[in-house]
């Protein structure tokens, strides 16, 4: 382990494993998000019953939710790595308001909620110094966010839950597909 | 080589501001958590500030919470502490270390000065606050 300083003749510590290449750090920040959300599911799953409801697509038409595609270069069939790359960062970016609607859902997991959130953002920055080609990254709408905000937040109870469902189980799922494509790059 | 380096240290006097700025030389700052300690003279080592890498939770020892604030920067790969209203007592070397004690999710922030480890530190620079 190291030595702190004060505490050996040079003053300096000697580092005792090799540094974290970006692909390791973007590996090991994916598996953080989806550890945050594991256990953001858990409080929801426990709170109702959404978790094995059936009448998600009822729910879904209302959720423009981020999902891979074919076409987005993704998949092992037709891999793209820069296409690939601009889908996951546009993805994460959409994500954004979704996750800032997690914010008010949770009572015991408030701090859980906040961590994913602010880690997604630190992911995104990740991605960006990875990226070559950051122009073709759209950044959604702060007022077509906003509106979608107040129309989610104003949804009656079971509607709400079921989107905190949805949004969790769909997160997790792009994340997923996001760490089998970058581990291919 | 693979070091941290600090800059923004000197001669201050009580009441006033200095802001502390540390960098890596061989890996990527951004991707771990930094630690700000000092040592005063002749007391032992205090870790003040810290910022995770992982989530941007910080955390402030007592002794400075509402004077200090640490950040992040991307564009530059640094992490800075703004350190102001600053008093006598605040006089003493002060160190960066960059650790990797934040990746699991669910860590303790307020261990952050204590009992985690940090891979990296660097030499130190002086502050003094003196009139």
């Known amino acids: 382990a190291p030595v702190p300083p004060g505490e050996d003749s040079k003053d300096v510590a000697a580092p005792h494993r090799q540094p974290l290449t970006s692909s390791e750090r973007i590996d090991k920040q994916i598996r953080y998000i989806l550890d945050g959300i594991s256990a953001l599911r858990k409080e929801t799953c426990n709170k109702s019953n959404m978790c094995e409801s059936s009448k998600e697509a009822l729910a879904e038409n209302n959720l423009n939710l981020p999902k891979m595609a074919e076409k987005d270069g993704c998949f092992q069939s037709g891999f793209n790595e820069e296409t690939c790359l601009v889908k996951i960062i546009t993805g994460l970016l959409e994500f954004e308001v979704y996750l800032e609607y997690l914010q008010n859902r949770f009572e015991s997991s408030e701090e859980q909620a906040r961590a994913v959130q602010m880690s997604t953002k630190v992911l995104i920055q990740f991605l960006q110094k990875k990226a070559k080609n950051l122009d073709a990254i759209t950044t959604p709408d702060p007022t077509t966010n906003a509106s979608l905000l107040t129309k989610l937040q104003a949804q009656n109870q079971w509607l709400q839950d079921m989107t905190t469902h949805l949004i969790l189980r769909s997160f997790k799922e792009f994340l997923q597909s996001s760490l089998r494509a970058l581990r291919q790059m | 080589q693979l070091q941290l380096a600090e800059t923004g240290g000197g001669l201050v006097q009580p009441g006033g501001s200095l802001r502390l700025s540390c960098a890596a030389s061989?890996?990527?700052?951004?991707?771990?958590?930094v630690g700000w300690f000092r040592q005063a003279p002749g007391k032992e080592r205090e870790g003040i500030s810290c910022?995770?890498?992982?989530?941007?939770?910080?955390y402030y020892a007592d002794s400075v919470k509402g004077r200090f604030t640490i950040s992040r920067d991307y564009a530059k790969s640094t992490v800075s502490l703004q350190m102001n209203s600053l008093k006598p007592e605040d006089t003493g070397v002060y160190y960066c270390a960059a650790g990797t004690w934040d990746l699991k999710f669910g860590y303790n922030i307020s261990a952050c000065v204590g009992s985690y480890e940090y891979d990296y530190w660097d030499q130190g620079t002086q502050v003094t606050v003196s009139s």
């Open positions: 061989g890996f990527t700052l951004d991707y771990y958590a």
């Open positions: 910022i995770s890498s992982s989530d941007l939770k910080t």
